[in-house]
């Protein structure tokens, strides 16, 4: 009876369990009753990082110097190239696909320390009573408006991203 599942590092094809290709190799032809799976090494600047049945290897990532990127670790047939940013610049994400001089603090966060040549911007969450409604690389959290000092009352509570809304006091007749 033909198998319905295969062992680890195998795949099911034509009611048969074939060996997957090892990392660094791509599939050329599936196994048959009489032959093993045929695999070929990935070419220069290509890779596959898992046991696979891919017919094409992936291209190594290009670290584009026009985006401020440079190679941190050269790719192999089993690993992708790892990019990093030029000195003094910071990756915009873990994948490091582009570079920023320094990060900004999102709404709800204020700048605790402005970036320097050696350190990135340090952000801090706005505590109760303070807010930031902008992305900024220099603005701190701002205190909520004090309605009382303007002889007004709070009509809408503030948050870490919004100021309070003040309004006139209800006059009792």
């Amino acid at each position: 009876e033909p198998p319905t599942a295969c062992r680890e590092k195998q795949y099911l094809i034509n009611s048969q369990c074939c060996s997957l290709c090892q990392p660094g190799q791509k599939l050329v032809s599936d196994c048959t009753e009489f032959t093993e799976t045929e695999c070929l090494p990935c070419g220069e600047s290509e890779f596959l990082d898992t046991w696979n049945r891919e017919t094409h290897c992936h291209q190594h990532k290009y670290c584009d110097p026009n985006l401020g990127l440079r190679v941190q670790q050269k790719g192999t047939s089993e690993t992708d190239t790892i990019c990093t940013c030029e000195e003094g610049w910071h990756c915009t994400s873990e994948a490091c696909e582009s570079c920023v001089l320094h990060r900004s603090c999102s709404p709800g966060f204020g700048v605790k320390q402005i970036a320097t040549g050696v350190s990135d911007t340090i952000c801090e969450p706005c505590p109760v009573g303070f807010f930031s409604n902008v992305s900024s690389a220099f603005e701190k959290c701002h205190p909520w408006t004090s309605c009382e000092t303007k002889d007004l009352v709070v009509q809408q509570a503030g948050t870490n991203k919004t100021d309070v809304v003040c309004g006139p006091q209800d006059r009792l007749r």
């Epitope: 026009n66 985006l67 401020g68 940013c85 030029e86 610049w89 915009t92 582009s98 570079c99 920023v100 001089l101 320094h102 990060r103 900004s104 902008v134 992305s135 900024s136 690389a137 220099f138 603005e139």
Partner: nanobody, 116 residues
């Protein structure tokens, strides 16, 4: 495509003044925090000054506080840096930048040389 074109640099004597301009295009200028940076020969980028989108809040590095004034004209999509009481240590290429400061958004800069 973001374009930032700095101008107004030149040779000036110590104690003199210059006004730098940065003409912006390719983005909604009035919606962005803007910065001036500078890079002296053989040194890293130094943060000089910043201004919020509305032009109501500013930041100055200690080294230029009281001497430099940042401003913007959102109707002209232009950022300015008025530099007074210039010193030899202000000699650098000055760049403007928008938030976030993407590597490929940089302008060419304008050279300021303070020398007698």
């Amino acid at each position: 495509e973001v374009q930032l074109l700095e101008s107004g640099g030149g040779l000036v004597q110590p104690g003199g003044s210059l006004r730098l301009s940065c003409a912006a295009s390719g983005f909604t200028f009035a919606g962005y925090e803007m910065w001036w940076f500078r890079q002296a020969p053989g040194k890293g980028l130094e943060r000089v000054s910043a201004i919020n989108p509305q032009g109501t809040r500013t930041y100055y590095a200690d080294s230029v506080m009281g001497r430099f004034t940042i401003s913007r004209d959102n109707s002209k999509n232009t950022l300015y840096l008025q530099m007074n009481s210039l010193r030899a240590e202000d000699t650098a290429v000055y760049y403007c930048a928008k938030l976030p400061f993407m590597f490929d958004d940089r302008g060419q800069g304008t050279l300021v040389t303070v020398s007698s």
